[in-house]
């Protein structure tokens, strides 16, 4: 039977009596940073080739033994899961190997640093296919270090590193922390996040997803036919790396945004038991398990959308929050949320010649994430129409009035501390899918898109009174671009996507003694492309 | 993830850029700046990478390196340039005492000196 | 689930030699470091000795060294301390310890056996 | 001799806080990771806090962590008569290259 990892992260449709997908990855190659490795191990022999690469620190220790195996233990491990010929994620993918991890399993930033500049050196003399870099490391949080990954990623190389093994917000490690990377967490055969004794797999915003990272089967270096089974977020994001060989050898011309968005997209959703995640991180943490697509090719017809949660703004006064999306990802929507409930709102704004998304902290506030839906929308022009607060009448109302654009967000801001004492609003009227309604306190901002075959509806779901949490999902076929709550009153916490599900948290009404007037909408806008439908269609 | 105006956790040592008594003094009023890592038992003191200005070319950052070595000599400070960072990133790795950082914060094109630190396999 | 359970405790005449073993469960064994701490009657806690996961590094509290030593069998999941030359002043419960993790062995010591106490008296 | 230094004890009434701070140097406390151990009469010590302030799941978030310079200190808020016991700091000396532990503090709640 095959081992457990290997069946979690396969469709179904590809189950049999061993893991065979269709292309292993034959296009792409697959940089390995980590320690020495075995490379006349049977299971990666002829797979991986040992760069003459190697800047490592001194071992620790005054009687330290320098022992072969030992010292190839990590790496080889890690070249087998992603292209081992009886136990590997990407059988076909070709490897190369870095030595910055010694035989401790230690390194430096400077060594790593030096070998992304070896690859991104070999990536101009000699231009191949396709690269994945998987950096199964980490260390505390690195400036440099995140900006020679954001560099590489930018020449077109996809990064996929560990989140760390040591139950914190991997923001606070890197390469974990870098934007452009993809950071992988760990969850084992029952779906939950991975214990490595008092510690465990990290989590938070700076995780990307997680996938298979204890008890995994995978070459030893004890002997050239041995195996073995280790833990942790390496194991993890060498899964990653190797679906991500498999779907570039597919999709060869993929940018690393598209593939972070199908990442994303074809993983197992809501299957990871949040409760083991600190409460304040649960929000925050993607409960996504990676796994391979149905079919390698024509996911293209997709409307792909992801949610990126900003840094927390801090408790001061006039803190804000900043949301960005990737270069390639448009800024579809932007919400915001505060665990107090005292923010004031949230707009998008343009900085350096892109869109982004920004919350702001009200007085008393402990502080507010802004929450951006970055989506790829090939050939979209996209505007944000604002409407000053309204004051008299009785809400705020912004429409797309450009012919041909359409409603994919809707944000509001207040400069008044607490939209609470103020009367609300009452539900907007329907039949109006290209307008966004909000307080008469506040000013209103409406995301405009054009974009070939893009097209767009509202779906909203009020209770009478807020009782914790509002939902409201898109239907299958539809992708979830917006997600904002009305009315925008004091008891609401805010408004964020979950996967394709808008999510509107309030106060119970139990601790707020709010009256039933106070009605909480979850309004979602839901998008199409039937311009990318038509287009793949076309291709097959 | 994170984010350049994120709400990490470091040391950030900002020093206001002055002439001492350079050719190319950098900019007045821009601020090179001092990372290192948070976790103590990680960080190496004694090895710093000096990131440059995005557009620097590999010969100003070797001219920035010696200019460095030139300077530390003259207080009498022994330094070692590691290793001459292009293609990612310009900037060099450089062996010294931490005492040299204020003057190496002021050198033309630099943006910011981070000390090395440890990473670990996961 | 997680235990360590210590064992070879009791009484020896001083210039003697004892073995202690601690016997792990619920665990991977071999992923983690592993620590033998002592305290003596009314006294704190004194560390012994350190052995990395893999068996590759030792470390020894100067008290102890050069008489003490620490070894492990993964297959066995078995922790020893092998003590030689003892003293009066080694007189002690002895705890073995799990280390917070395998590479990061400084961070301290998460599990902890009951205690086997070694009692070295003429 | 232990190269960390804590009050011998430290008393407050039920409901209180107390804190119990550790003394070191550079070539520990200064940098290198701090945990916190707890005694309770006639058992093994039992992990608090490890990497300065964290703390193990099953530790309540009455018990804190902190780290100022060559210094560190753990605090316990709403005091309970089951807090009585001994707390030891440890951390590795980069010097001695070994672990260390702190003199211990017995806590009494009156």
């Known amino acids: 039977s095959i081992p457990w990892n290997l069946e979690r992260i396969t469709p179904p449709r590809y189950r049999a009596d061993e893991y065979q997908p269709p292309d292993g990855g034959s296009l792409v190659e697959v940089y390995l940073l980590d320690t020495s490795i075995q490379s006349d191990h049977r299971e990666i022999e002829g797979r991986v080739m040992v760069t003459d690469f190697e800047n490592v620190p001194e071992e620790d220790g005054t009687r330290f033994h320098r022992q072969a195996s030992k010292c190839d233990s990590h790496g080889t491990h890690l070249a087998g899961v992603v292209s081992g010929r009886d136990a590997g994620v990407a059988k076909g993918a070709s490897m190369r190997s870095l030595r910055v991890l010694n035989c401790q399993g230690k390194g430096t930033v400077s060594g790593t640093l030096i070998g992304l500049e070896f690859i991104r050196k070999s990536q101009l003399v000699q231009p191949v296919g396709p690269l994945v870099v998987l950096l199964p490391l980490a260390g505390g949080y690195s400036r440099v270090l995140n900006a020679a990954c954001q560099r590489l990623a930018r020449a077109g190389v996809v990064l996929v590193t560990a989140a760390g093994n040591f139950r914190d917000d991997a923001c606070l490690y890197s390469p974990a922390s870098a934007p452009e990377v993809i950071t992988v967490g760990a969850t084992n055969a029952q779906d939950q996040p991975v214990t490595l004794g008092t510690l465990g797999t990290n989590f938070g915003r700076c995780v990307d997803l997680f996938a298979p990272g204890e008890d995994i089967i995978g070459a030893s270096s004890d002997c050239s036919t041995c195996f073995v089974s280790q833990s942790g977020t390496s194991q993890a994001a060498a899964h990653v790396a190797g679906i991500a060989a498999m779907m570039l050898s597919a999709e060869p011309e993929l940018t690393l945004a598209e593939l972070r968005q199908r990442l994303i997209h074809f993983s197992a959703k809501d299957v990871i038991n949040e409760a083991w995640f600190p409460e304040d991180q649960r929000v925050l943490t993607p409960n996504l398990v990676a796994a391979l697509p149905p079919s390698t090719h024509g996911a293209g017809w997709q409307l792909f959308c992801r949610t990126v949660w900003s840094a927390h703004s801090g408790p001061t006064r006039m803190a804000t929050a900043i949301a960005r999306c990737a270069p390639d990802e448009e800024l579809l929507s932007c919400s915001s949320f505060s665990r107090s409930g005292k923010r004031r709102g949230e707009r998008m704004e343009a900085q350096g010649g892109k869109l982004v998304c920004r919350a702001h902290n009200a007085f008393g506030g402990e502080g507010v994430y802004a929450i951006a839906r970055c989506c790829l929308l090939p050939q979209a022009n996209c505007s944000v129409h604002t409407a000053p607060p309204a004051e008299a009448s009785m809400g705020t109302r912004v429409h797309c009035h450009q012919q041909g654009h359409v409603l994919t967000g809707c944000s509001s801001h207040w400069e008044v501390e607490d939209l609470g004492t103020h009367k609300p609003p009452v539900l907007r009227p329907r039949g109006q899918p290209n307008q966004c309604v909000g307080h008469r306190e506040a000013s209103i901002h409406a995301s405009c898109c054009h974009a070939p075959g893009l097209e767009c509806k509202v779906k909203e779901h009020g209770i009478p009174a807020p009782q914790g949490q509002v939902t409201v999902a898109c239907e299958e076929g539809w992708t979830l671009t917006g997600c904002s709550a009305l009315p925008g009153t004091s008891h609401v916490l805010g408004a964020y996507a979950v996967d394709n599900t808008c999510v509107v948290r309030s106060r119970d009404v139990s601790t707020t003694g709010s009256t039933s007037e106070e009605a909480v909408t979850a309004v979602a806008i839901c998008c199409r492309s039937r311009h990318l439908a038509q287009a793949s269609q076309e291709l097959q | 993830q994170e984010d350049e105006d994120g709400d990490y956790e470091e040391l950030v040592l900002a020093l206001r850029s002055e002439e001492d008594g350079l050719a190319e003094a950098p900019e007045h009023g821009t601020t090179a700046t001092f990372h290192r890592c948070a976790k103590d038992p990680w960080r190496l003191p004694g090895t710093y990478v000096v990131v440059l200005k995005e557009e620097t070319h590999l010969s100003q950052s070797e001219r920035t390196a010696r200019r460095l070595q030139a300077q530390a000599a003259r207080r009498g400070y022994l330094t070692k340039i590691l290793h001459v960072f292009h293609g990612l990133l310009p900037g060099f790795l450089v062996k010294m005492s931490g005492d040299l950082l204020e003057l190496a914060l002021k050198l033309p094109h630099v943006d910011y000196i981070e000390e090395d630190s440890s990473v670990f396999a996961q | 689930q997680v235990q360590l359970v210590e064992s070879g405790g009791g009484v020896v005449q001083p210039g003697r030699s004892l073995r202690l073993s601690c016997a792990a469960s619920g665990f991977t064994f071999s992923s983690f470091g592993m620590h033998w701490v002592r305290q003596a009657p009314g006294k704190g806690l004194e560390w012994v000795a350190l052995?990395?996961?893999?068996?590759?590094?030792?470390y020894y509290a100067d008290s102890v060294k050069g008489r003490f030593t620490i070894s492990r069998d993964n297959s066995k999941n078995t922790l020893y301390l092998q003590m030689n030359s003892l003293r009066a002043e080694d007189t002690a419960v002895y705890y073995c310890a799990r280390a917070i993790a395998a590479l990061y062995y400084y961070y301290g010591m998460d599990v902890w056996g009951h205690g086997t106490t070694v009692t070295v008296s003429s | 001799q232990s190269v960390l230094t804590q009050p011998p004890s430290v008393s407050a009434a039920p409901g209180q806080k107390v804190t119990i701070s550790c003394s070191g140097s550079s070539s520990n406390i200064g940098n290198n990771f701090v945990s916190w151990y707890q005694q309770l009469p006639g058992t093994a010590p039992k992990l608090l806090i490890y990497?300065?302030?964290k703390r193990p799941s099953g530790i309540p978030d009455r018990f804190s962590g902190s780290k100022s310079g060559t210094s560190a200190t753990l605090g316990i808020t709403g005091l309970q008569t089951g807090d009585e016991a001994d707390y030891y700091c440890g951390t590795w000396d980069s010097s001695l290259s070994g672990y260390v532990f702190g003199t211990g503090t017995r806590v009494t709640v009156l």
């Open positions: 052995i990395w996961n893999d068996g590759s590094n030792k």
């Open positions: 990497d300065y302030n």
